[in-house]
Interface confidence: low
C-alpha cells in the first residue's frame, strides 16, 4: 500500500489485498475494519466511514475477527447426559461433552451433538477394546480358561482360579469352584495369587487321581473386581 494510506476505509491498489484484520467491502469498494471477537458489524462501512462494531448480546458470540451483521447464537443448554466444558461467552460458543460412562455418537465441530451410553459386556464377555470419548466399547467372548461374571463396560475376561481339586469347572461366565483346599491362580497379568500355593505347576487338571469330594460351602471367590481397563466400553 502507498505510505499515505493508513486509515480505513481506503481503496486498495489494483491487484492488492486488504491488510490483516480488514476486509474488502464489495459495496463500498473499500478496505474496512473487521470487528474483534465478541463484536459484530452494526453498521457497514461506506466510502467515507469505517465499520461500526457493537458487542454481542447475551447468549450470542463471535469467535473470530469478523464483519457479520449478527452474532452467532450459542448452542442450546447441555443435555442430562452431557457436561458443559466451556460456557457460552461473547467470544466462544458453549461446548458440551459426554459425561463419564457415555461416548459421543455424533460429534460436531466443537463438543458433542449426541451422546450414547457405553456398551456393557454381559457375563461371558469381556472388554476387548475400551470405550473412548468418541467410540463405543467392543466386547469379545471370554476365551477358554477365562471368564467374566459381570455386566460391565470396563471389566475384561479374567483367568479361572486353579484348583488342587475342582468342585465345579469354570466356564466363560463363571469362575472355577474349588474344594476346601486353598485355590491358586494362574499367573496371568493382573491376576491375584492367593496364599498357600499348592504347587509350582499351574495346571487345570487335578494333580491327584482321587475323585473330588463334595464342594465346601465356604469356597474362595476371586479377590475383588479386576482393575478397570483404560476408558470404558460393552456389548
Amino acid at each position: 500500500l502507498p505510505a499515505q494510506v493508513a486509515f480505513t476505509p481506503y481503496a486498495p491498489e489494483p491487484g492488492s489485498t486488504c491488510r490483516l484484520r480488514e476486509y474488502y467491502d464489495q459495496t463500498a469498494q473499500m478496505c474496512c475494519s473487521k470487528c474483534s471477537p465478541g463484536q459484530h458489524a452494526k453498521v457497514f462501512c461506506t466510502k467515507t466511514s469505517d465499520t461500526v462494531c457493537d458487542s454481542c448480546e447475551d447468549s450470542t458470540y463471535t469467535q473470530l475477527w469478523n464483519w457479520v451483521p449478527e452474532c452467532l447464537s450459542c448452542g442450546s443448554r447441555c443435555s442430562s447426559d452431557q457436561v458443559e466444558t466451556q460456557a457460552c461467552t461473547r467470544e466462544q460458543n458453549r461446548i458440551c461433552t459426554c459425561r463419564p460412562g457415555w461416548y459421543c455418537a455424533l460429534s460436531k465441530q466443537e463438543g458433542c451433538r449426541l451422546c450414547a451410553p457405553l456398551r456393557k459386556c454381559r457375563p461371558g464377555f469381556g472388554v476387548a477394546r475400551p470405550g473412548t470419548e468418541t467410540s463405543d466399547v467392543v466386547c469379545k467372548p471370554c476365551a477358554p480358561g477365562t471368564f467374566s461374571n459381570t455386566t460391565s463396560s470396563t471389566d475384561i475376561c479374567r483367568p479361572h482360579q486353579i484348583c488342587n481339586v475342582v468342585a465345579i469347572p469354570g466356564n466363560a461366565s463363571m469362575d472355577a469352584v474349588c474344594t476346601s483346599t486353598s485355590p491358586t491362580r494362574s499367573m496371568a497379568p493382573g491376576a491375584v495369587h492367593l496364599p498357600q500355593p499348592v504347587s509350582t505347576r499351574s495346571q487345570h487338571t487335578q494333580p491327584t487321581p482321587e475323585p473330588s469330594t463334595a464342594p465346601s460351602t465356604s469356597f474362595l471367590l476371586p479377590m475383588g473386581p479386576s482393575p478397570p481397563a483404560e476408558g470404558s466400553t460393552g456389548d
Epitope: 489494483p14 474488502y24 464489495q26 469498494q29
Partner: antibody, heavy 115, light 106 residues
Framework: QIQLVQSGPELKKPGETVKISCKAS????????MQWVQKMPGKGFKWIGW????????KYAEDFKGRFAFSLETSASTAYLQISNLKNEDTATYFC????????WGQGTTLTVSS | QIVLTQSPAIMSASPGEKVTITCSAS?????MHWFQQKPGTSPKLWIY???NLASGVPARFSGSGSGTSYSLTISRMEAEDAATYYC?????????FGGGTKLEIK
C-alpha cells in the same frame, strides 16, 4: 493468475432467453463482487449492475431491471447473466468484470439477436 | 446518473506528439478511471483513481483532474498507443462510462 473466462458467442431469436457464464480463477471467488457491462456496436459501455458474490445479492441499473438477471454457482466460481425475452436491441458484447477496481475483465461474449 | 463526455471522439497523432484526451462529468466526482481498448479485446484498466498508472502502463501516460474535469495525457505518442480510451466514474451510483476517444496514429 487471475482470469475471467466467458462463454462463447450466442445467436438467438427475439423472445428467446440466453444465459452467459463467467468463470473466475486465480482468486477466492467470494471476495470480490462481479459486475456486468454491455457494449453495443459502435457505442459506449453501459453498466448493467453487479452481484455480491458473498451474499448473492444483485443490484441492477435502472435501464436493466426486469429482463436481466444475475446468478452464481459459487462452488464452480462462476457468475451468470441471463437475459429473457430477447429483443433485437440486446445485440451487443457483454463483459463480466470484477467489481473492485482491479481492472480484471472477461474477454466478452457477443450476443446477436436476429429473426 | 452522471454523464461523462469525452473529447475529441476521434483524433490522430504523429509519433512523438503530445496527446491529451479530456473527460467532462455532469456532476463532481471524486476520481476518474481510464481504460484502453483495442479491437477484439476486452478493456484494460489504464489509469485508476485519476492519476495512478495501472501495472505495465508506460510512464509516458499520465492522468490528472478534479471535480468535473479530467484528462489523460500521452507525453510522446507511439504506435502501440493507438486504441480507444474510455473514462469511467465509480464515485456516484450507477457507474458510468464516457463515449470513448478513438486515438489513431498518423
Amino acid at each position: 493468475q487471475i482470469q475471467l473466462v466467458q462463454s462463447g458467442p450466442e445467436l438467438k431469436k427475439p423472445g428467446e432467453t440466453v444465459k452467459i457464464s463467467c468463470k473466475a480463477s486465480g482468486y477466492t471467488f467470494t471476495t470480490a463482487g462481479m459486475q456486468w457491462v454491455q457494449k453495443m456496436p459502435g457505442k459506449g459501455f453501459k453498466w448493467i449492475g453487479w452481484i455480491n458474490t458473498h451474499s448473492g445479492e444483485p443490484k441492477y441499473a435502472e435501464d436493466f431491471k426486469g429482463r436481466f438477471a444475475f446468478s452464481l454457482e459459487t462452488s464452480a466460481s462462476t457468475a451468470y447473466l441471463q437475459i429473457s425475452n430477447l429483443k433485437n436491441e440486446d445485440t451487443a458484447t457483454y463483459f463480466c468484470a470484477r467489481w473492485d477496481g482491479t481492472g480484471y475483465w472477461g474477454q466478452g461474449t457477443t450476443l446477436t439477436v436476429s429473426s | 446518473q452522471i454523464v461523462l463526455t469525452q473529447s475529441p471522439a476521434i483524433m490522430s497523432a504523429s509519433p512523438g506528439e503530445k496527446v491529451t484526451i479530456t473527460c467532462s462529468a455532469s456532476s463532481s466526482v471524486s476520481y476518474m478511471h481510464w481504460f484502453q481498448q483495442k479491437p477484439g479485446t476486452s478493456p484494460k484498466l489504464w489509469i485508476y483513481s485519476t492519476s495512478n498508472l495501472a501495472s505495465g502502463v508506460p510512464a509516458r501516460f499520465s492522468g490528472s483532474g478534479s471535480g468535473t474535469s479530467y484528462s489523460l495525457t500521452i507525453s510522446r505518442m507511439e504506435a502501440e498507443d493507438a486504441a480507444t480510451y474510455y473514462c469511467q466514474q465509480r464515485s456516484s451510483y450507477p457507474p458510468t462510462f464516457g463515449g470513448g476517444t478513438k486515438l489513431e496514429i498518423k
